[in-house]
Each structure stands twice: as structure tokens, then as C-alpha cells.
Interface confidence: low
């Protein structure tokens, strides 16, 4: 019997698969590369093109740059010869490996081009505020694609000592649920660092100003973050859901959580930041649904409810 | 103050369908979930199921499943339970109540008595 | 389900004495995270809804007087009226709200002597 060749193991003819592709997000800083990745298997060996927005993209004609695209391979390297060449490449990127069997298609590969963090030049009134009541010094970033680091110092570059009290909020705010006379200093500064471009910048320093009084007022608690009862956030399955809550008062009031459907998943859950932010670890299905914090002092309570909707990554 | 607001009694023949309502006023319509309650002339209470009214996400007592349809309309705030193919057993008082999660029930209606009767 | 089982069915007391009475539950109703038992009792007047008087097993809602309180842990608590009033007369009733579905008891009908 004679076996036809194609009919061979080593031969068998398989359609595109992709093996290798960069990830649906992209963030590149000026100084940066621009890297794409798509890595495909088949027989016979397949061939890759790009689409940028729909429209197809071929890297090797881009001019100005220097393009350096791997044999065999739909992955390719872009170096610019300017600090800004990156923003010219934003867009969405797909690639399509194809051969007689068919073609295979990447996701959807958005890249964003971050320009160099500047804080926008301000001038920063004093804050004035009684002892005892609350006050949020804001941070305010230039935004970002990319997640960023806040920290609050002093002009000694002494971090600002956070507790129940005072604490930095996931927005870079720095938020008091009361002020104490110690807290007068005129130089609290928020410091923004981009990990991508190895760049802090910093804020013009904040004068707060406290005003002594005879007798601190008690008061219930409000929710200085989120101000509204309740907010519908959308949670991507094995990724993981910061929630938060900030609250003032006198005296401090404390953070409390609660999943009203019943228990919180112990084994994934942590909380941070003296209770205000509750950190949950690769959201799955059954982490849909709502999550309460509660605030509480001796006078009273306030609380937020989050509904939360868990969706495909 | 929260108000929730159910219709009085409802006669209804075997077989037939009805739907109660629970109008809710004094609070953020859709901030708090909303319960239902069945409890049979002289009998304990047992727990039906409950609707987020933001999303309309429900949770129903298994034993209730195939009887009862939780719905709600945001526009007036108000919340609906369809009750089907009644028979006697269905015969009971129903409530809303508001649950937020840490208070447990603290809010309720005054209750519908459903008679089924032919 | 949870199964939640009261008892007694039904008691008589005097005015001005102590009253208890007990609920168990088929499992824990503590959630070791927050240290707070899911579990509320309400009363039930005749022709009225029921009324929250105490949440977290311990906890009593603003407006019910202090002399009713509840304690207990895990599957096993108590609601106590400390004196007992003419008012007091109704069904109590205990309720879990950890895991679906919510479950109640079958009830203690409490009067006087």
C-alpha cells in the first residue's frame, strides 16, 4: 500500500493558530521601543499581515523609524529617532495569519503612546479649616494610561504619616476625617511617579492651616468618598476589584464591610488602607452582586453600596 | 420616611394569575434590595426571594421558583411580585420589605392578603 | 437551607418578669471576617407586618426599648425581654440572612400570665 505523502505525519497540513500575541493593552512612553507581538503555527507556514484601525499597516514602510521584523514571525520592533515618535503609532492593532487552510485572527491590540507627565502650573491657595472638622487636599495627576504611584510628603521628602484618620485615597486625594492642630504645616506635597518613564513629578505644595478651637464638635459620619449611596461598577472575571470607602466624623469613625447576600469570600478577600479599601483577588462569577461599607462613630453611621457586575475578561 | 405601600386584599380563582405591587417612597428606590414574604393565615413567615431594583438582578427561595416572578419599574418605584397558578396554599398575606444588608428587614408593607378562591 | 428552629412554640409570663426564648440554626451564622452573626429577630403584632427589634444577633434598632436584647454566637442565641410589658404580647421571630435562601423560624408566641 502506498501512503500518499501529504498523508504523512510530518505532512499534515494544519490551518493558522496563534501561539503568541501581544496583550489588549499597550502603553509605550516616549523614550520606549514599539514591540508587537504575533507568533502563529501551521502548514504550510503561514503568512502574517497587520491592520491599524482597520487599514491595513506595514510596519517595513513606516518612515523615519527603524523597523525590525522577525523571520517567520508576524512580531515586529519599531525604534523611533524623536522623543514623540510613539504618538504616531496609537491606534488599534490586529494581526492575521493565514495560509491555504485558512487565517487566524489576534484580539484586538490597543496601543496608547504616553507623553511626558507635566503637572499644570497652579497657584495653590491656603486651606483653612477648623480643628476637628474634615478636609481633602486634592492630588489631582495629569492622567495616565498607565497606573501611577501618588505618595504625600513633606518638603523634608518624610512621608505624610497616614492611619484611621488620615489616609490617601486610591485617587491620590489626601483625605482628614478630622484635623488636629498638628496637622498645620504648609508644605504637604503630592508626588506623582510614572514607573514607565521613571519620572516623578511633583505638585505645588499645599498650606494647611488649622484654626484651634475650645471644643471639637462631635459628628456623624459622612462618606467623603464616594459622596453618592450607591455606584454600579462593571468587574472583569480573574481580575482583581478594589472597592472603597472614606469617610469623616468626629470621633474618626471606623470602616466596616459587608456583602448583604452573605459572607464575603474570606479566602480572597484583604483589606487595606485601616478598612477603607477592600481588595478582592480574581473576581469570578459568583462575586457578582452588591457590597456594602459602613462607617461608624458613637454619634452614628453612613454607608455606600456597591453593585457589582461581574463580566468576561 | 420610608414608605412602602401595598395594595389591600386581592380574590383570585384557581388557576388564575395576579400581580402585587409594593410602591416604594422616602429612599433611593434603587439602593436597597426588595424582599418578598409569604406568611399563610396562622402560619410563620417564610422568605420568597428578592430584587435589586438598580439592575433587576433577582434571588429567588428555590421553593418559590415556579410560582413567583419579581420585576420591578423604576420610573414609579415601585417593585412587583406575579404570582401564578394559585391554588388554596397560595392563600396568604405578602409583603415587601426593604433589606439593606445590615439591618436585616427594617423596612415592610402592610402586607396583601391574596384569597384564592373560586 | 439553613433550618432555623425556635423554642419554645409558645409562652406565658407575668408582668414585670424576665422573658427568654431561644433560636438555633442548623449551621453558623458567624462570618469569622467581621465577627458579626447574621441572624434578627422581629416581632409580629397581630394584623401588622413584623417589626426588626435586634440585628448582628446583638444589635438593637433605634426606637426599641432596652429591654429587649439578644445575644448568642455561632448556631445558638437568645432574645430577652428584661420586664416583660402588656405591649410585648406577639410573635417573635428569628431570622438568618447569611446564606440564601433567608430563612425564618417557625415563631414563639409570648403572652401573659
Known amino acids: 500500500i502506498q501512503i500518499p505523502e501529504e498523508y504523512e505525519g510530518h505532512h499534515v497540513m494544519e490551518p493558522p493558530v496563534i501561539t503568541e500575541q501581544s496583550p489588549r493593552r499597550l502603553v509605550v512612553f516616549p523614550t520606549d521601543d514599539i514591540s508587537l507581538k504575533c507568533e502563529a503555527s501551521g502548514k504550510p507556514e503561514v503568512q502574517f499581515r497587520w491592520t491599524r484601525d482597520g487599514v491595513h499597516f506595514k510596519p517595513k514602510e513606516e518612515l523615519g523609524v527603524t523597523v525590525y521584523q522577525s523571520p517567520h514571525s508576524g512580531s515586529f520592533t519599531i525604534t523611533g529617532n524623536n522623543s514623540n515618535f510613539a504618538q504616531r503609532f496609537q491606534g488599534i492593532y490586529r494581526c492575521f495569519a493565514s495560509n491555504k487552510l485558512g487565517t487566524a485572527m489576534s484580539h484586538e491590540i490597543r496601543l496608547m503612546a504616553e507623553g511626558a507627565p507635566k503637572w499644570p502650573k497652579e497657584t495653590v491657595k491656603p486651606v483653612e479649616v477648623e480643628e476637628g472638622e474634615s478636609v481633602v487636599l486634592p492630588c489631582n495627576p495629569p492622567p495616565s494610561a498607565e497606573p501611577l504611584r501618588i505618595y504625600w510628603m513633606n518638603s523634608k521628602i518624610l512621608h505624610i504619616k497616614q492611619d484611621e484618620r488620615v489616609t490617601m485615597g486610591q485617587n491620590g486625594n489626601l483625605y482628614f476625617a478630622n484635623v488636629l492642630t498638628s496637622d498645620n504645616h504648609s508644605d504637604y506635597i503630592c508626588h506623582a511617579h510614572f514607573p514607565g518613564t521613571r519620572t516623578i513629578i511633583q505638585k505645588e505644595p499645599i498650606d494647611l492651616r488649622v484654626k484651634a478651637t475650645n471644643s471639637m464638635i462631635d459628628r456623624k459620619p459622612r462618606l467623603l468618598f464616594p459622596t453618592n449611596s450607591s455606584s454600579h461598577l462593571v468587574a472583569l472575571q480573574g481580575q482583581p476589584l478594589v472597592l472603597e470607602c472614606i469617610a469623616e466624623g468626629f470621633p474618626t469613625p471606623t470602616i466596616k464591610w459587608l456583602r448583604p447576600s452573605g459572607p464575603m469570600p474570606a479566602d480572597r478577600v484583604t483589606y487595606q488602607n485601616h478598612n477603607k479599601t477592600l481588595q478582592l483577588l480574581k473576581v469570578g462569577e459568583e462575586d457578582d452582586g452588591e457590597y456594602r461599607c459602613l462607617a461608624e462613630n458613637s454619634l452614628g453611621s453612613a454607608r455606600h453600596a456597591y453593585y457589582v457586575t461581574v463580566e468576561a475578561a | 420616611q420610608v414608605q412602602l405601600v401595598q395594595p389591600g386584599d386581592e380574590l383570585v380563582k384557581p388557576g388564575a394569575s395576579v400581580k402585587l405591587s409594593c410602591k416604594a417612597s422616602g429612599y433611593t428606590f434603587t439602593s436597597y434590595w426588595m424582599q418578598w414574604v409569604k406568611q399563610r393565615p396562622g402560619q410563620g413567615l417564610e422568605w420568597i426571594g428578592e430584587i435589586n431594583p438598580s439592575n433587576g438582578r433577582t434571588n429567588y427561595n428555590e421553593m418559590f421558583k415556579s410560582k413567583a416572578v419579581l420585576s420591578v419599574d423604576k420610573s414609579v418605584s415601585t417593585a412587583y411580585m406575579q404570582l401564578s397558578s394559585l391554588t388554596a396554599e397560595d392563600t396568604a398575606v405578602y409583603y415587601c420589605?426593604?433589606?439593606?444588608?445590615?439591618?436585616?428587614?427594617?423596612?415592610w408593607g402592610q402586607g396583601t392578603l391574596v384569597t384564592v378562591s373560586s | 437551607d439553613i433550618v432555623m428552629t425556635q423554642s419554645p412554640d409558645s409562652l406565658a409570663v407575668s408582668l414585670g418578669e424576665r422573658v427568654t426564648m431561644n433560636c438555633k440554626s442548623s449551621q453558623s451564622l458567624l462570618y469569622s471576617s467581621n465577627q458579626k452573626n447574621y441572624l434578627a429577630w422581629y416581632q409580629q403584632k397581630p394584623g401588622q407586618p413584623p417589626k426588626l427589634l435586634i440585628y448582628w444577633a446583638s444589635t438593637r434598632e433605634s426606637g426599641v426599648p432596652d429591654r429587649f436584647s439578644g445575644s448568642g454566637s455561632g448556631t445558638d442565641f437568645t432574645l430577652t425581654i428584661s420586664s416583660l410589658q402588656a405591649e410585648d404580647v406577639a410573635l417573635y421571630y428569628c431570622?438568618?440572612?447569611?446564606?440564601?435562601?433567608?430563612?425564618f423560624g417557625q415563631g414563639t408566641k409570648l403572652e401573659i400570665k
Open positions: 431570622q438568618q440572612y447569611h446564606s440564601y435562601p433567608f430563612t
Open positions: 420589605a426593604l433589606y439593606d444588608g445590615y439591618y436585616a428587614m427594617d423596612y
